[in-house]
Interface confidence: medium
């Protein structure tokens, strides 16, 4: 229904706390370089204005769209051009072009220092002094680094952050309590960030239809007892919500997400038997819980999928007269029977089925032609199953760090032109798939591995798009979203690459490495490993093992030495010489 004042409507629906949080996220995602203090000032102004509109919907400017109001606020920032360059050109445009322009200037890799967690005591002091400001900083810092983070979910993580601090800051050993709990929140949030970026990429590149297909498959897996009409309704709603968030309509997105949670909880009987526990929670937790809900039990009496989609003589009539509904029904029926498949795989199967009908329904004997389609799915199913098997075996053998290194070598050989920091980030994230997925029960491994890898590879594509350097990466990234992972898996050593010349300074280290946290130490070593592969793309596994083993011993030895600086200065050149020889 239409409201006189959109901003008043959202303020009333969301409540002041969530309203302010979402406005802060919106501003932080649009203007990623502005300090917290500047954004919080704008947030307060917008909130005060919203309150005047709640009091009187006919007040001046209350009838303006939220994009107009937000855009006007952003464009009024002094020195906008000095800080943001061509983003300031957006301000010369009218809505909706102005908002589109802002969206195009979102930076997936902003030049910001990594978010450093303060030490426990300092954290607790500032949290206890002003919890609202502390959590505001958290929202700001995450949102500006992840300009597509799903806003209502970020509010949920802020709430989790709040819970952890409230609990741990009363403990005697604050650090022991905080570290593992905040690490867990951070890990979940980082995964959420890459997953949401993938959804926005899907929406931006391939439109709502592609996203809705993804949603139908996902919902059908989770709610196999729900009927197609119910699944379609849920998928349509989820598509709308994600479109809004990806498009910067964060207030509408959060409001609609809360509405969807309400609907699901009021209609549990026709959706899933697993929802009740979620439905007893407050709004943010409820939505999050529903988004992470376990699969309902598959109905026992499902007939073979072949009856409707292969054996029925009317298949071509069904396909011709209502393509989207028929293919949607196929995707629904196949997905509800296969919670053990990844969504990417299910979409590839649906695509294969569609291509088969396109071909066969134009032939003389369609049933004979499409009669073997289910058997033709087999290689498509086997490929990701083998990927999971070989990668999980490798992970179990090497552990997370060793597995990351194996992935790093593989991907540096596939795309040596890509910058080393990007390769290291991608390989570290891809390598985490082992810890995340390989320990799961067999039936959950494939969906976990492939859908996670797809999200990480999307991040690689997004970064590469900014500065394209590898034709192979461009080729994999510009194809269909569901074919990306198989495309990357199929890449081999890039034969066109001219090896990088050996630079001693790339492999020169100093005593500062000794005081780095383990994670930073690993990144230093992995950076060296990528550089080695760029120097010798065809180095054997044994050669790389020798050099990296030698390197690890060198660091270990010098960090234990009495005169560390001297050790690094004298032993370093020897290491470089030995490495060159080993790789010759």
């Amino acid at each position: 229904e239409a409201h006189k004042s959109e901003i008043a409507h959202r303020f009333k629906d969301l409540g002041e706390q969530h309203f302010k949080g979402l406005v802060l996220i919106a501003f932080s995602q649009y203007l990623q370089k502005c300090p917290y203090e500047e954004h919080i000032k704008l947030v307060q102004e917008v909130t005060d204005f919203a309150k005047t509109c709640v009091a009187d919907e006919n007040a001046e400017n209350c009838d303006k769209s939220i994009h107009t109001l937000f855009g006007d606020k952003l464009c009024a920032i002094p020195k906008l051009r000095d800080n943001y360059g061509e983003l300031a050109d957006c301000c010369a445009k009218q809505e909706p072009e102005r908002n589109e322009c802002f969206l195009q200037h979102k930076d997936d890799n902003p030049n910001l220092p990594p978010f450093q967690r303060p030490e426990a005591e300092a954290m607790c002091t500032s949290f206890q002094e002003n919890p609202t400001s502390f959590l505001g900083h958290y929202l700001h810092e995450v949102a500006r680094r992840h300009p597509y983070f799903y806003a209502p979910e970020l509010l949920y993580y802020a709430e989790k952050y709040n819970e952890v601090l409230t609990q741990c800051c009363t403990e005697s050993d604050k650090a022991a309590c905080l570290t593992p709990k905040l690490d867990a929140v951070k890990e979940k949030a980082l995964v959420a960030a890459v997953r949401q970026r993938m959804k926005c990429s899907s929406m931006q590149r391939f439109g709502e239809r592609a996203f809705k297909a993804w949603a139908v498959a996902r919902m059908s897996q989770r709610f196999p007892n729900a009927e197609f009409a119910e699944i379609t309704k849920l998928a349509t709603d989820v598509t709308k919500i994600n479109k809004e968030c990806c498009h910067g309509d964060l207030l509408e997105c959060a409001d609609d997400r809360a509405e969807l949670a309400k609907y699901m909880c009021e209609n549990q009987a026709t959706i899933s038997s697993k929802l009740q526990a979620c439905c007893d929670k407050p709004v943010l937790q409820k939505s999050q819980c529903l988004a992470e809900i376990e699969h309902d039990n598959i109905p026992a009496d499902l007939p073979s999928i072949a009856a409707d989609f292969v054996e029925d003589k009317e298949v071509c009539k069904n396909y011709a007269e209502a393509k989207d509904v028929f293919l949607g029904t196929f995707l629904y029926e196949y997905s509800r029977r296969h919670p053990d498949y990844s969504v990417s795989l299910l979409l590839r199967l649906a695509k294969k089925y569609e291509a088969t009908l396109e071909k066969c329904c134009a032939e003389g004997d369609p049933p004979a032609c499409y009669g073997t389609v289910l058997a033709e799915f087999q290689p498509l199913v086997e490929e990701p199953k083998n990927l999971v098997k070989t990668n999980c075996e490798l992970y179990e053998k090497l552990g997370e760090y060793g597995f990351q290194n194996a992935v790093l070598v593989r991907y540096t050989q596939k795309a040596p032109q890509v910058s080393t920091p990007t390769l290291v980030e991608a390989a570290r994230n891809l390598g985490r798939v082992g810890t995340k997925c390989c320990t799961l029960p067999e039936a959950q491994r494939l969906p976990c591995v492939e859908d996670y890898l797809s999200a990480i590879l999307n991040r690689l594509c997004v970064l590469h798009e900014k500065t394209p350097v590898s034709e192979k990466v461009t080729k994999c990234c510009s194809g269909s979203l569901v074919e990306r992972r198989p495309c990357f898996s199929a890449l081999t050593v890039d034969e066109t690459y001219v090896p990088k010349e050996f630079k001693a300074e790339t492999f020169t280290f100093h005593s500062d490495i000794c005081t780095l946290p383990d994670k930073e130490k690993q990144i230093k070593k992995q950076t060296a490993l990528a550089e080695l592969v760029k120097h010798k793309p065809k180095a054997t596994e044994d050669q790389l093992k020798t050099v990296m083993g030698d390197f690890a011993q060198f660091v270990d030895k010098c960090c234990k030495a009495a005169d560390k600086d001297n050790c690094f200065a004298t032993e370093g050149p020897n290491l470089v010489a030995r490495s060159k020889e080993a790789l010759a």
Epitope: E227, F228, A229, P303, D308, D312, N318, F326
Partner: nanobody, 126 residues
Framework: EVQLLESGGGLVQPGGSLRLSCAAS????????VAWFRQAPGKEREFVAG????????YYADSVKGRFTISRDNSKNTLYLQMNSLRPEDTAVYYC???????????????????WGQGTLVTVSS
């Protein structure tokens, strides 16, 4: 749950017409695939006509094409079968069946329909 109740059967002369109705409750009839089946004494139950849910795609058995018309009135939540040019071999008990879930797909396979009416007898005889 879907409840189905057929009516309109009876005795009719060859060449005559009848209109069968099937009133549905517990479900909107336009949301589900629905069909008419028939079973003659001592024979298997056979598909007569069907209509998809959400999309008005109609299907007919070859033996009734051009003579029978399936339709529905969503406001009355009722399915119809208009039978013209009736023949003695059309004599059977006519059943209405519903198949929620996959709305589009009206299968000719009786086993795929979970909901059935109790049937109405049609006798074509002079």
């Amino acid at each position: 749950e879907v409840q189905l109740l057929e009516s309109g059967g009876g005795l009719v002369q060859p060449g005559g017409s009848l209109r069968l109705s099937c009133a549905a409750s517990g479900r909107y009839i336009d949301e589900t695939a629905v069909a008419w089946f028939r079973q003659a004494p001592g024979k298997e139950r056979e598909f007569v006509a069907g209509i998809g849910g959400g999309v008005d795609i109609t299907y007919y058995a070859d033996s009734v094409k051009g003579r029978f018309t399936i339709s529905r009135d969503n406001s009355k939540n009722t399915l119809y079968l208009q039978m013209n040019s009736l023949r003695p071999e059309d004599t059977a008990v006519y059943y209405c069946a519903a198949r929620p879930g996959s709305p589009l797909i009206t299968s000719k396979v009786a086993d795929l329909y979970p909901y059935w009416g109790q049937g109405t007898l049609v006798t074509v005889s002079s």
